[in-house]
Amino acid sequence: ELCDDDPPEIPHATFKAMAYKEGTMLNCECKRGFRRIKSGSLYMLCTGNSSHSSWDNQCQCTSSATRNTTKQVTPQPEEQKERKTTEMQSPMQPVDQASLPGHCREPPPWENEATERIYHFVVGQMVYYQCVQGYRALHRGPAESVCKMTHGKTRWTQPQLICTGEMETSQFPGEEKPQASPEGRPESETSCLVTTTDFQIQTEMAATMETSIFTTEYQ
């Protein structure tokens, strides 16, 4: 049920999970100069019942100075198969995340945690993409990727997000940029393409909220 690969990368975009499906593993990694405690867990595991999901095991790091080594803890070879590295995340959550049944929230940081987190995702996991600072969405089709099982193999769907650093792009004559949300898309998805002032104010707020979801999760 583990996904064989990492989610696809999109040029000039980052992704993150808003919640983690039961079965997801998070490696217990320590920052340089620290190591897992002797009897410590190798990973945290998202587990749960029908009403509540939470992370099993706790990651604990201790100073490795006593062993006269500064070797950083890395996953064992068997752990490396489904690794996904993300930047370190803070415990702040989007408000709706905890209510997703069968999913765990972002685990809070542990003392002396490494600066990157390595997740092992499971089938059904969804991750969301957005353009990095300085880039905007030229085209925002489905901006998420789902790990699916097909013909006995796992595969992440390809997000249809194109991020561009080009500020001046053409638009076809006589056509105004969207004023409302066509085809039921959230308004925030049109924010970086809108030219009308009133709507821009709304969408900038929405875009700010959208961005804050990303920035509060990732330090």
């Epitope: 040029p11 085209h139 489905p142 249809q160 080009e166 076809f172 066509p182 085809e183």
Partner: antibody, heavy 115, light 107 residues
Framework: QVQLVQSGAEVKKPGASLKISCKGS????????MHWVRQAPGQGLEWIGV????????IYAQKFQGRATMTVDKSTSTAYLELSSLRSEDTAVYYC????????WGQGTTVTVSS | DIQMTQSPSSLSASVGDRVTITCRAS??????LEWYQQKPGKAPKLLIY???TLAEGVPSRFSGSGSGTDFTLTISSLQPEDFATYYC?????????FGQGTKLEIK
């Protein structure tokens, strides 16, 4: 099933303009950007530009900036490429291709520019 | 603009052979690379995307590898229908440029 169907072959005189179409079916048209690519006889593939089928925003290869115009009509799920001031070097097969990874292509439109 | 250079430009091989085509980018493009197959008079067909992911419906004898600037398309055992021209292309940034193509011919 996913299909991109392009308009028929065109013969044009130098200096004229041309508009070719690419109609998408079998998927949600506005979910995927549309690229335009051309191939001169016996040559390789040349990227012309990409248009967001959702917003109409477009980016062109520098070579085509000002001479090519990509548009979309969401109501008919059709993308268009217009090329003005045609010259003999524009003789080529023009393709539309879907999405980030160009996973589906139109059958191609043969354009001949000749006096 | 990013230049994509394929080698060889043409290649003669026999059915059953293992064939490798390489593509080099003029700068780091991470894994934002596709491989296409084109037969005479037909539109290109996507084989591999994101450097190594096999497109739907493509036989498993095709595989892609590489990251950064150097990429490889491998056909493990050539079939008669594989004789065609192959193109690499990046989608790192606009303009999305293609390699000049590799023509695979029957020996």
């Amino acid at each position: 099933q996913v299909q991109l169907v392009q308009s028929g072959a065109e013969v044009k005189k130098p200096g004229a303009s041309l508009k070719i179409s690419c109609k998408g079916s079998g998927y949600t048209f506005t979910d995927y950007a549309m690229h335009w690519v051309r191939q001169a006889p016996g040559q390789g593939l040349e990227w012309i530009g990409v248009i967001s089928t959702y917003s109409g925003d477009a980016i062109y290869a520098q070579k085509f900036q000002g001479r090519a115009t990509m548009t979309v009509d969401k109501s008919t799920s059709t993308a268009y490429l217009e090329l003005s001031s045609l010259r003999s070097e524009d003789t080529a097969v023009y393709y539309c291709a879907r999405g980030v990874t160009f996973d589906y292509w139109g059958q191609g439109t043969t354009v001949t520019v000749s006096s | 603009d990013i230049q994509m250079t394929q080698s060889p430009s043409s290649l003669s091989a026999s059915v059953g052979d293992r064939v490798t085509i390489t593509c080099r980018a003029s700068q780091d493009i991470s894994n934002y690379l596709e491989w296409y197959q084109q037969k005479p008079g037909k539109a290109p067909k996507l084989l591999i995307y994101n450097a190594k992911t096999l497109a739907e419906g493509v036989p498993s004898r095709f595989s892609g590898s590489g990251s950064g600037t150097d990429f490889t398309l491998t056909i493990s055992s050539l079939q008669p229908e594989d004789f065609a021209t192959y193109y690499c292309q990046h989608h790192y940034d606009t303009p999305y440029t293609f390699g000049q193509g590799t023509k695979l011919e029957i020996k």
